[in-house]
Structures are given as C-alpha cells and as structure tokens.
Amino acid sequence: KFSKQSWGLENEALIVRCPRQGKSSYIVDWYYSQTNKSIPTQERNRVFASGQLLKFLPAEVADSGIYTCIVRSPTFNRTGYANVTIYKKQPDCNVPDYLMYSTVSGSEKNSKIYCPTIDLYNWTAPLEWFKNCQALQGSRYKAHKSFLVIDNVMTDDAGDYTCKFIHNENGANYSVTATRSFTVKDEQGFSRFPVIRAPAHNETKEVEIGENTNLTCSACFGKGAQFLATVQWQLNGNKITDFSEPRIQQEEGQNQSFSNGLACVNTVLRIADVKEEDLLLRYDCLALNLHGLRRHTIRLSRKNPIDHQSTYC
C-alpha cells in the first residue's frame, strides 16, 4: 500500500521520493530494508538521503532493492517503501517495457509529451528529445520547459520518445534519460473482444531465486481510442492491491499503439527478490473491455542450475 516502484539505468542519476508525505519540516530517515542500514545524509556519498528524497548519484545495478523511509511527525511515524531497480544500459536502441513510463495520447490539437520524473531533478533547459533513439530535428518539434510539443501531429508520430537531461548536484553533472510511448488518437476506431498478446496461455517462465523478474501483460482491444480497455495482473485470483507483499508491484496500465494502428495496453508486474513461495502462485493476466474478459495464466518455475560437474574422468 505504501510502496512505490522506481527504476533507472546504471551510471545515470536516479532520485526517488518517499511514498509517505509530510510537512517539509519533518525529519525523514531512510534505510536499506534488507540490512536495516541507515542511508547517510552527507552529500559526499554516492547514495544519500535528502529529506523526502533518496538520491543515487549515479546509480549502480547493485543499488537495486527495497528502501524504507520513515517520516517522523510529532505524534507518529509514517513508513513507506521505495522499490528500486537499476538496469544495465541496453546495447541496442530498443527500450524494454519495464523501462517505460506511462503512455500519453495526443491529437492534432494537443500533442504535449511531458518528460517523466523530471520535477525531481535540478535541471536546466533545454531538454534533448529522441524518438526511437533518433534525435528529433525540424521545426515541428519544440522543446518547451519540461515537455515536447509536436506541431501537426500525424499517425506516424506515434512511438517511443526519450527525454535526456542533466541533473546538477553541487557542481557535478549526471545524465538522466526517461522514455514513454506516445500514441496518436485515431478518430475512426472500433472495439473488439480483447486479444492477449503476452503471456501465452498456461506459459511457464523460468526464474532464479533471489533475482528480480518482470511479467508483461499485453492485450489489444481494437483500433483508435477505446472507451474501456484495461489490463491487470491477479495473484491466485486476487487483486494485486489486496496482496500485501511490497516486493510484488504492478505498474499502472500503459497504452501502446502499434504500426497496424491497433490500440493495445500493457502492464508490467515487477517481482523483486524472487522467493520460493512466488513459484506457488498463479499469475493471471486479465484483459477487459465492453466486449468481455479474457484471462491468460502464467506460472513461475525455478531455473535449472547449470551442471558444473567436470567432463573429465
């Protein structure tokens, strides 16, 4: 309930906010949950706490884990959890689902794409913007404050947009990138029974105990703007929100429009520090619209350890 997912790339700055809010004068203590070790507040540290914010300058893959923040108010302490995952940089241009922020939709009249999480950082204009990893050039694109405006939006403007900016902390500069999908609303659309693209029904995914894993639930619902189109994960038939395990978190549903114009939605279930008991759960990807509900089930299995026995006698 009081947990939030945050993610970033290694060697970039990542700033995380405590999910519990309070007055600016309240003291906030941060801990690394697994060791209960206090996070220092001295800025000379690579990872340090600054009030409601936890700063990784820069982040490393080993920083991944659950962090506890305690907001100390006069009458009681409020505890929150920040579930942080730091990923290695992708060698190719493709940005995986688990690094994507929520999708925005645009039309000819309104085509603002906000740079996600930028308000947490100390940055100065201008922002750099990329579409499918290509730097945006031309008079149609205007970087304004923390958002991008596209003039005369067309359907082929849909795609993945990445903003890149520099965070400054005490004179040192750190790069930050964030990516989100942009879809273009199609006036002429239709709706149909949901088709789940992933996972396949009764699929089994191999995982390693102690590692992090992500499950993507992706479904298509027709073409153009949809009145109702939702995807979600369930655990053993229960909503994620009813399942009080901060290691397992579902992102908000994310719209995606593919080249064929289909309106598709996906959501990622993030499981941190996979445990034996996670293998016993049934993971249901649910896709729902006005036409009905479709369900695909996936289970987790333990990855067989590599046989390290010698091949010599």
Epitope: K1, P19, Q21, S24, T75, D119
Partner: antibody, heavy 116, light 113 residues
C-alpha cells in the same frame, strides 16, 4: 504561480451525492498532500482530512468518516471530495488547502447547499 | 483531539493601535524531534478563503507585512498586530498543525472603530 481552482457551487437535495473538485497548478502535484476544510455559514473552520497525492491514501477526521470520500486524478492534478447521502448540516463552503507547514495555498471554496 | 481556545472572541480597535490576541491549546504543540511549535495563524476576510500569516508559531509567511508577529511555545501563543490598518478587518484563526485531527480555534473577530 501556485493555484488551487475549485468547481462551482452546488445545490442538492437531502440524500443526494455531490462531488467537488480542486485542480492544482503551478507546482508538482504529487509533492504535497491536499487537505479539505469545511466552513458552515457563519461558523469556524473544521479540518475534514487529507489525501496523499502520491499514493492516493486518504486520512479522514473523526467526524468525516463514512459518507465522505477523497480521491484524485493524478494526470489532471486534481483531487475530489465526494459526500454521499447529503444532510442539511452538510450545507457549507468546502475548501481544499495544500499541505505544508501551515496551509499556505487554498482554493477559493465551493459552496454546497443542501435543501429540500 | 487537541482543543484550541482563542480569546477574546472579538476586538474593536482604532487604526494605528497595537492589538494582541491569544490562542491556547489543550496539549503542547512543541515537537521535540525538531524543536518546532506546530501552530499556524490565519486571517479570513468575508467571502474569501483563509490566508496563512504565521507558521511554526513565529515564522511569517512570505509576503505577510511585518506588523504581524507570532510568539509563544508549548500551549500558549499570541498573535500581535503592531499597528492595525483598515485592511486588517477580518477573523483570525489559530490552528493546531501538530497532530490529527488538525483543529482550528473559534476565531477572534477584529473590528475597526
């Protein structure tokens, strides 16, 4: 500049439901909680509770549990107050106020009149 | 709940006079964790939302004239207007900003002679 813009006045009958909105602008919405304060005509101020705008968690004052619901639409930087099964004593001006050391920013208020 | 008691309920003063009003809380509003007193003062004019004047018992909100001063600690607090102006006609509320439920005093109505 920071602004909290509330929806317009409402005239309702007892037993009906009202939902009023408070749209924030000029700051990062999810950085600050939002409080709701009630002021009946000619009376003093009553704190109703607040909502955590980052995770959507509401906290209600003792006299405002049950018929009252706080909600939010993060993408629109908007919080909502819904009052169900309206009673005559719900007639009041309702203010949203941004959390902080003291409430430095207030909406203009929404007058809800409950009358048969 | 913390009860906030304001006195007097109303005051009538002339322009230029000094005025003080009192606010007492039923429990201490001092937080030992940071030595802050969580008390706020507001001014409310007819048909308007309250305006924050003072927070932390004595810190003046940005843009508030320096004729407004807050003082006190623990359970006893005072708002002083050093030289009342015509535009100060309003109701003044103190607020427990310390713990839930945040409670307001009954107000002091300032009238100009």
């Amino acid at each position: 500049q920071i602004q909290l813009a509330q929806s317009g006045p409402e005239l309702k009958k007892p037993g009906e439901t009202v939902k009023i909105s408070c749209k924030a602008s000029g700051y990062t919405f999810i950085n600050y909680g939002m409080n709701w304060v009630k002021q009946a005509p000619g009376k003093d101020l009553k704190w109703m509770g607040w909502i955590n705008t980052y995770i959507g968690e509401p906290t209600y004052g003792d006299n405002f549990k049950g018929r009252f619901a706080f909600s939010l639409e993060t993408s629109a930087s908007t919080v909502y107050l819904q009052i169900n099964n309206l009673k005559n004593e719900d007639t009041a001006t309702y203010f949203c106020a941004r959390e902080g050391d003291g409430f430095a920013y207030w909406g203009q208020g929404t007058l809800v009149t409950v009358s048969a | 709940d913390i009860v906030m008691t304001q006195s007097p309920p109303s005051l009538s003063v002339s322009v230029g006079e000094k005025v003080t009003m009192s606010c007492k809380s039923s429990q201490s509003l001092l937080y030992s964790g940071n030595q802050n007193n969580y008390l706020a003062w507001y001014q409310q004019k007819p048909g308007q939302p309250p305006k924050l004047l003072i927070y932390g018992a004595s810190t003046r909100e940005s843009g508030v004239p320096d004729r407004f001063t807050g003082s006190g600690s623990g359970t006893d607090f005072t708002l002083t207007i050093s030289s009342v102006q015509a535009e100060d006609l309003a109701v003044y509320y103190c607020q427990n900003d310390h713990s839930y439920p945040y409670t307001f005093g009954g107000g002091t109505k300032l009238e100009i002679k």
